[in-house]
């Protein structure tokens, strides 16, 4: 069954945590659907963003942070492991120095920490996708 | 009650036709939700686009056409009559020489015909909005 989109869930992250998302683009890549995953510092959508991950399917991925309401330096990648019309599994792992983004089991993007992952309180998944799975796994202490 | 998004409906347009859309952005303008309305030449989403209207709420509007799979010259406007968090009513009227886009009863954008409006067979409304009304009115002969 489908999860609502935008999908918002409270989350606490630290080294070893992994966010797993399963979904499918809602349009063909020619029409440039988007997927966005945002790690927020508060439960409010206007809050700052520790890690912003946006896919323009078929074109590019941009990553960034939003600090005190201002977007910072954008990191862009043309790597496009997503397949037109196909379901994807995305996992974002919190490593000691960075986020590692896996797409369908393949390491595809990294983003160095700018803000401590412990500052994350909420994860939002949204834009032009249907969502079938969202999970945050916590490293056992 | 809400209409599904993406929302797709068969349509035949000519001078005097008006497409009316009521909806609401799914996120605050700080997060830059999008609204897109596409007038297609076929019932398929990969088909050419006679009139492409895309709002990045709070930032800008772009209009264009997609012909034989290729995007043409983009027309951009910074005019932003949409209100953060508020419902909008959008109407797109087919005039003899152009499309006229009204937002909440106010003439806000125009786009000169590049392709005959009679070539339109389908309208799609999508991206980051909830949709409560979609209507195509035809001029009585």
């Amino acid at each position: 069954s489908l999860l609502p989109v935008p999908y918002t869930e409270a989350a606490s992250l630290s080294t070893g945590s992994t966010v797993t998302i399963k979904g499918r683009p809602l349009a063909c890549f020619l029409n440039e659907p988007y997927l966005q995953v945002d790690f927020h510092t508060e439960m409010k959508e206007e809050s700052d963003i520790v890690f912003h991950f946006q896919v323009c399917f078929g074109r590019r991925v941009v990553m960034n942070s939003r600090e005190y309401g201002a977007w910072k330096q954008q990191v862009e990648s043309k790597n496009m492991p997503f397949q037109d019309g196909q379901e994807f599994e995305l996992s974002i792992s919190v490593l000691p120095d960075k986020y590692q983004v896996m797409v369908n089991g393949q390491s595809s993007y990294t983003f160095d920490h700018r803000i401590k992952p412990e500052a994350v309180k909420m994860v939002q998944v949204w834009r032009d996708i249907s969502l079938t799975k969202f999970n945050v796994s916590y490293l056992k202490r | 009650s809400l209409l599904p998004v993406p929302y797709t409906e068969a349509a035949s347009l000519s001078t005097g036709s008006t497409v009316t859309i009521k909806g609401r952005p799914l996120a605050c303008f700080l997060n830059e939700p999008y609204l897109q309305v596409d007038f297609h030449t076929e019932m398929k989403e990969e088909s050419d686009i006679v009139f492409h209207f895309q709002v990045c709420f709070g930032r800008r509007v772009v209009m264009n056409s997609r012909e034989y799979g290729a995007w043409k010259q983009q027309v951009e406007s910074k005019n932003m009559p949409f209100q953060d968090g508020q419902e909008f009513e959008l109407s797109i009227s087919v005039l003899p020489d152009k499309y006229q886009v009204m937002v909440n009863g106010q003439s806000s954008y125009t786009f000169d015909h590049r392709i005959k409006p009679e070539a339109v067979k389908m309208v799609q409304v999508w991206r980051d909005i909830s949709l409560t009304k979609f209507n195509v009115s035809y001029l009585k002969r």
Partner: antibody, heavy 122, light 107 residues
Framework: QVQRQESGPGLVKPSQTLSLTCTVS??????????WSWIRQPPGKGLEWIGY???????SYSPSLKSRTSISRDTSNNQFSLQLSSVTPEDTAVYYC??????????????WGKGTLVTVSS | SSALTQPSAVSVSLGQTARITCQGG??????VSWYTQKPGQAPVLVIY???ERPTGIPERFSGSSSGDTATLTISGAQAEDEADYYC??????????FGGGTHLTVL
């Protein structure tokens, strides 16, 4: 009343570059939604579109001439220019500049210059 | 050869109706324009958007299109209408094509 006037050398040697300028008076070449075209007409023959520059500065060229064509503009002097490289005698023609609202395929070209004859010969 | 095909010549008696055709365009999608040109002069736009007349063009000029054929009609042709006529359309909105031209003779 919008007027335009083509100017440039009337004689160009083969393999050289043909350069023409169109000076527009009575309206700005950056006025929204207007495009500015070059068209040519060989002696005794029909019209051939070469390309245009839009109000935004973007260009579009005829596929058959694209590899040799460049259209640019000088907004401070309200002029736009044509450069056609590697010319041959087949490029001998009257060259016209013209204006169109928005897409020329929709609205046609409503104002034309008088035309200037360019002969390609050694 | 032109992407749009016109008859090379059409004759009409003074006061009668002349029809000039233009074939081979995608007129279901793209509009057609028509120009008249007299010797030694620049072309003049007489019809745009299939059937619209610019200011100053006499009402006897009209246009239509259907499928792959567009037609320029001159109702009650005058001696001054003797000229070359060109159709113009597009293979896309940013690629302009002209017809080969038709010489109209008014008898």
């Amino acid at each position: 009343q919008v007027q335009r006037q083509e100017s440039g050398p009337g004689l160009v040697k083969p393999s050289q570059t043909l350069s023409l300028t169109c000076t527009v008076s009575g309206g700005s070449i950056t006025t929204n939604y207007y495009s500015w075209s070059w068209i040519r007409q060989p002696p005794g023959k029909g019209l051939e579109w070469i390309g245009y520059i839009a109000y935004s500065g973007s260009t579009s060229y005829s596929p058959s001439l694209k590899s040799r064509t460049s259209i640019s503009r000088d907004t401070s002097n309200n002029q736009f220019s044509l450069q056609l490289s590697s010319v041959t005698p087949e490029d001998t023609a009257v060259y016209y500049c013209a204006r169109s609202r928005s897409s020329p395929t929709t609205f046609g070209m409503d104002y034309w210059g008088k035309g200037t004859l360019v002969t390609v010969s050694s | 050869s032109s992407a749009l095909t016109q008859p090379s010549a059409v004759s009409v008696s003074l006061g009668q109706t002349a029809r000039i055709t233009c074939q081979g365009g995608n007129f279901g999608r793209y509009y057609v324009s028509w120009y008249t040109q007299k010797p030694g002069q620049a072309p003049v736009l007489v019809i745009y958007q299939d059937s619209e007349r610019p200011t100053g063009i006499p009402e006897r000029f009209s246009g239509s299109s259907s499928g792959d054929t567009a037609t320029l009609t001159i109702s009650g042709a005058q001696a001054e209408d003797e000229a070359d006529y060109y159709c113009q359309s597009g293979t896309s909105s940013d690629n302009i094509v002209f017809g080969g031209g038709t010489h109209l003779t008014v008898l």
